[in-house]
């Protein structure tokens, strides 16, 4: 708390301009009407006020606005953003991209800290699902922000929005969190051509199930072993040889070096050897010759 | 580039009141805040009442808190003050002024005269 003192004569803020940056912290809280602030914060940020300084300054700003600071003043607060707390945070109303953008570029560089997150979190809510311009603002601004959704927020996101989503956007996204955006991307890009709805939709296929895995091995795509290596083990597993042959085209090499991991390990056993020694690449584990292979989940569906 | 043109002053008693009219050329809300300054003679320009364009948050300083109001008419171009209870210390010319976003104010109308006196 700053202490209450009388302003010295003839200091008086009558604008907010670089004569306050030599006021002293009482100064400054005894000086500087908080009402004058608030109207002109868009000069705050051009100012070179220390962190002292600007403790000050969000002093006033609270006392004026106990509920929650209004959209004009948030939109300007630059570099006092930083001062904020997630608790003050959530007393907003932030309603335009711009302001969000503002705030967002004070952070640029940095990791998401708890306001930030907070921050969001209100502006998401607010516009009550997570559209288009938004996801673009926020992926540009921090590319891992898809995947630090629930799968349950990620379900407000709508088809339209994914065109917003860049390869390196999913690159930390989980199973669960593909399975709910794989259906929107294959919605989003239903109307494209074959290479050209690959190209979009291979970074979704983590969440792709079997039968779209079949579908696409019958469009040449010539898939790379990287996205093979992310695919669901269990939309893997019932992929026959040449089903996978011709989904990876040049790239059915590459099972050799993973042959050791999943989803290649699981798949390979659940293969007969017969099968696999077509392919020539020398993979072993499968079923030998001669063995009957028992679907125990298809037969406990059945009784 | 935006003219201001101020009207609206006289003469008047104490504990009087007067509307002051600002007529800009360009729309209102092309500058972030609109205002009103006053100079009394042998003293600086003092700002007296400003409103922020988009949002409409105002400011007083304590001199006329109470006893000032500044409104704004987008679609005329107009921006008004009204002041009441008006004293001898009110007395200056009354400036109509423009700022951009991140600066100070900069476009200045002509000044109108106010002098309240019995």
């Known amino acids: 708390e700053v202490e209450k003192t009388a302003c010295p004569s003839g200091k008086k803020a009558r604008e907010i301009d670089e004569s306050l940056i030599f006021y002293k912290k009482w100064e400054l809280e005894a000086c500087v009407d908080a009402a004058l602030l608030a109207t002109q914060m868009d000069r705050v940020n051009a100012i070179p006020f220390t962190y002292e300084q600007l403790d000050v300054l969000k002093h006033k700003l609270d006392e004026l606005y106990p509920q929650g600071y209004p959209e004009s003043v948030i939109q300007h607060l630059g570099y006092l953003f930083l001062k904020m707390s997630p608790e003050d945070i959530r007393k907003w109303n932030v309603t335009s991209l711009e302001t969000l953008k503002a705030l967002l570029e004070v952070n640029k560089g940095h990791e998401m800290s708890p306001q930030v997150a907070t921050l969001i979190d209100r502006f998401v809510k607010g516009r009550g699902q997570l559209d288009k311009d938004t996801l673009d603002t926020l992926t540009a601004f921090y590319p891992g922000y898809l995947c630090s959704l629930s799968p349950e927020e990620l379900s407000s996101v709508p088809p339209s929005s994914i065109w917003a989503v860049r390869p390196q956007d999913l690159d930390t996204c989980d199973p669960r969190q593909l399975d709910v955006l794989y259906p929107k991307a294959r919605l989003a890009f239903q109307n494209m051509n074959g290479s050209e709805y690959f190209v979009k939709i291979q970074s979704f296929l983590g969440g792709a199930p079997t039968e779209d895995l079949k579908a696409l091995s019958q469009q040449n795509v010539s898939m790379d072993l990287a996205t093979f290596m992310k695919l669901r083990t269990d939309a893997v597993l019932p992929l026959t040889v040449a089903e996978v042959q011709k989904l990876l085209g040049p790239h059915v090499e590459g099972l050799k070096a993973e042959e050791r991991h999943r989803p290649v390990r699981d798949w390979i056993l659940r293969q007969r050897q017969d099968d696999l020694d077509t392919l020539g690449l020398g993979l072993q584990g499968g079923i030998p010759n001669g063995y009957l292979v028992l679907d125990l989940s298809m037969q406990e569906a059945l009784s | 580039e935006v003219q201001l043109v101020e009207s609206g002053g006289g003469l008047v008693q104490p504990g009087g009141s007067l509307r002051l009219s600002c007529a800009a050329s360009g729309s209102t809300s092309n500058y972030y805040a609109m205002g009103w300054f006053r100079q009394a003679p042998g003293k600086g320009r003092e700002l007296v009442a400003s409103i922020n364009s988009f949002d409409s948050i105002t400011y007083y300083p304590d001199s006329v808190e109470g006893r000032f109001t500044i409104s704004r008419d987008n679609a005329k171009r107009m921006v008004y003050l009204q002041m009441n209870s008006l004293r001898a210390e009110d007395t200056a010319v009354y400036y109509c002024?423009?700022?951009?976003?991140?600066?100070?104010?900069?476009?200045w109308g002509q000044g109108t005269q106010v002098t309240v006196s019995s």
């Open positions: 002024a423009a700022r951009k976003k991140g600066l100070a104010f900069s476009y």
